[in-house]
């Protein structure tokens, strides 16, 4: 027989199947061109001295063989004596160590047996009821396929899975979705219902992120508030990168995790926009306001868990920057203007109360007045800062109030509301003898002292009721006691105390009468 033909004679070895565990298996035959065909198989066991024979039986019952030698692949033409248009049965017999080993048989029509293409082009990935759904367009003119997938994680080997039979212009596969690790998938196809048909090559890798994007493990730090009333938010620790399977390393579209920074400005609730979402790489400048910051991780399946932080307000105060004048019509604040056409947000809240009770007012865009000052006025009827208590005031400014990251802090200070001069009057003034010509005057702290920076000083006034002479003694705002000396025994005096702010003189306390008793010597 010629080597290119299927030999219709008995093969050159005895016909006996050893039934051993080793031997030829996984025979695949398919058409490789208009007139050529190929069969390939695997051989399990020691290969030394093994001779392979491809056996073929026609539907007529006649059988022939090709001698392949030690090769496990053999090509033949449609003129080799094998009927390609009709069903044939093929198997491999391997002659080794004086015994014959036989592969399982495959029965097929060679003419129609073509090797399919793997899924080509765009493979769409989505999540369906906790599983992964892959979908792709069936390669043209190859409808009717059996599809398999294989998948691996960074730490596990390939695992094989079945997609089942497909018979449409689009094919799809349901695959397992890992919760916390990325996966690499590959798909392959073969003719449906054709025994012994050959699998296509594996498709290009499909890289799939975990169902849950990794929780961002990042840390922030906030710089000091600068002269411009802004402070930089900086990232101390980058988010950890997702570990990828081998075929997804480098460029792995599909597994990307995007981290976004969500800023929520808690201060100044009357502004138009309270939240802004930014890319994590672009770290913003913030005002001195209080913020909540969240880092949100998301992948193609949506957002994951987020990590949140609270950035407290910068409480550094500048007591001299704000001027407040109280008139009959109402109250006006003045402060150094930032620039032309600025919108200001004035926020106030009673000291010692929850931050949620802050009130604020937004000004229309304003230019500085001739003295370079910006102003905000309110009437008594408005009730703003009307109660006689300490308020914490912060003023923010922005040329673009709709942009959350462009606000800056102008100043933070304290203000005592209502009728501060009356409310601040010291009470419980008491006089105690100190020596033969002096007394100690004590009083309860003024309500103004609860308001840092508001109380400028106490003034103690002593009046000689005989001569009508008056002396005034300034006292540090931290003190609530003063010694009056140079007094004369037997003379009646009255003492009063007032509390002054930088812009307001206080109201005198009720006069307190006293005298130093004349000492009678024995």
């Amino acid at each position: 027989c010629r080597t290119s033909e299927c030999c219709f004679q008995d093969p050159p070895y005895p016909d006996a199947d050893s039934g051993s565990a080793s031997g030829p298996r996984d025979l695949r035959c398919y058409r490789i061109s208009s007139d050529r065909y190929e069969c390939s198989w695997q051989y399990e066991g020691p290969t030394a001295g093994v001779s392979h024979f491809l056996r073929c039986c026609l539907s007529s019952g006649r059988c022939c063989y090709f001698a392949a030698g030690s090769a496990t692949r053999l090509q033949f033409s449609d003129q080799a004596g094998v009927s390609v248009l009709y069903t044939v049965t093929l198997w491999v017999e391997s002659w080794a160590r004086n015994q014959t080993e036989k592969s399982p048989e495959v029965t097929l029509q060679l003419y129609n047996s073509v090797k399919y293409e793997p899924p080509l082009g765009d493979i769409k990935v989505s999540k369906l009821a906790g599983q992964l759904r892959m979908e792709w367009e069936t390669p043209d003119n190859q409808v009717g396929a059996e599809v398999q997938f294989r998948h691996r994680t960074p730490s596990s080997p390939w695992k094989l899975g079945d997609c089942g039979p497909q018979d449409d212009d689009t094919e799809s596969c349901l695959c397992p979705l890992e919760m916390n690790v990325a996966q690499e998938f590959q798909l392959r196809r073969r003719q449906l219902g054709s025994q012994g048909s050959s699998w296509s090559k594996w498709s290009s890798p499909v890289c799939v992120p975990p169902e849950n994007p990794p929780q961002p493990q990042v840390r922030f730090s906030v710089e000091q508030l600068g002269q411009d009333g802004r402070r930089r938010l900086t990232l101390k620790e980058q988010p950890t990168q997702l570990e990828l399977p081998e075929g997804c390393q480098g460029l792995a579209p599909g597994t990307e995790v995007t981290y976004r920074l969500q800023l929520h400005m808690l201060s100044c609730p009357c502004k138009a926009k309270a939240t802004r979402t930014l890319h994590l790489g672009k770290m913003p400048y913030l005002s001195g306001a209080a913020y909540n910051v969240a880092v949100i991780s998301s992948n193609q399946f949506g957002p994951g868990l987020n990590q949140t932080w609270h950035i407290p307000a910068d409480t550094h105060t500048e007591p001299v920057a704000l001027n407040i004048s109280v008139g009959t019509n109402g109250t006006t604040m003045y402060w150094p203007a930032r620039a032309q056409s600025m919108t200001y947000c004035i926020e106030w809240q009673p000291v010692g109360q929850d931050g949620g009770l802050a009130t604020c007012s937004l000004t229309a865009p304003q230019d500085p007045d001739p003295a370079g000052m910006a102003t905000y006025s309110w009437s008594r009827e408005s009730g703003a800062m009307g109660q006689e208590k300490c308020y914490y005031i912060t003023i923010f400014a922005s040329a673009h109030p709709e942009k959350l990251t462009l606000w800056s802090t102008v100043l933070s200070t304290y203000h005592f509301g209502g009728n501060a001069s009356a409310a601040g009057t010291p009470h419980h003034v008491s006089v105690k003898n100190h020596s033969l010509d002096s007394v100690s005057v004590d009083w309860a702290p003024s309500l103004l002292s609860t308001c840092p920076g508001v109380l400028k000083e106490y003034v103690v006034r002593c009046r000689d009721e005989d001569s009508k002479q008056v002396s005034e003694h300034p006292v540090q705002p931290t003190e609530t006691q003063v010694t009056l000396s140079g007094l004369r025994a037997g003379v009646a005096y009255t003492v009063q105390v007032r509390a002054d702010t930088a812009w307001l003189r206080g109201v005198w306390s009720q006069p307190q009468r006293f005298s130093i008793e004349v000492q009678v010597s024995d």
Partner: nanobody, 127 residues
């Protein structure tokens, strides 16, 4: 559903050449193969040749081998199959039909393997 329309038939001298076209439209992605058959009055349809679409593998009847060539071109949702005929003989005179199948089994020369057929185009070879 697939529609097939042939064109290009006509009168040609012995030894001459002619190119037939068959335009397939509709769900052409489901097709496995397209073929040419011919029929003369009072006779069965005779297989001429076939092309496996996904691989461009061709197969011809012995009577036309070496003289006829089948090819195809793809456009969006349309496949055009061609039959280039050269060295024409008077016995090539017939109505030429285009056929298409969407199953992977069966003998290419059997008419019952094909689900879709064109209306035919006349080829006359005169001496």
């Amino acid at each position: 559903e697939v529609q097939l329309v042939e064109s290009g038939g006509g009168l040609v001298q012995t030894g001459g050449s002619l190119r037939l076209s068959c335009a397939a439209s509709g769900r052409t992605s489901r097709l496995v193969a397209m073929g040419w058959f011919r029929q003369t009055p009072g006779k069965e349809r005779e297989f001429v040749g076939e092309i496996i679409l996904s691989k461009d593998f061709t197969y011809y009847a012995d009577s036309v081998k070496g003289r006829f060539t089948i090819s195809r071109a793809n456009a969006k949702n349309t496949i055009t199959m061609y039959l280039q005929m050269s060295s024409l003989k008077s016995e090539d005179t017939a109505v030429y039909y285009c056929a298409a199948r969407q199953n992977w089994s069966g003998h290419p020369a059997r008419t019952n393997e094909y689900e879709y057929w064109g209306q035919g185009t006349q080829v006359t070879v005169s001496s």
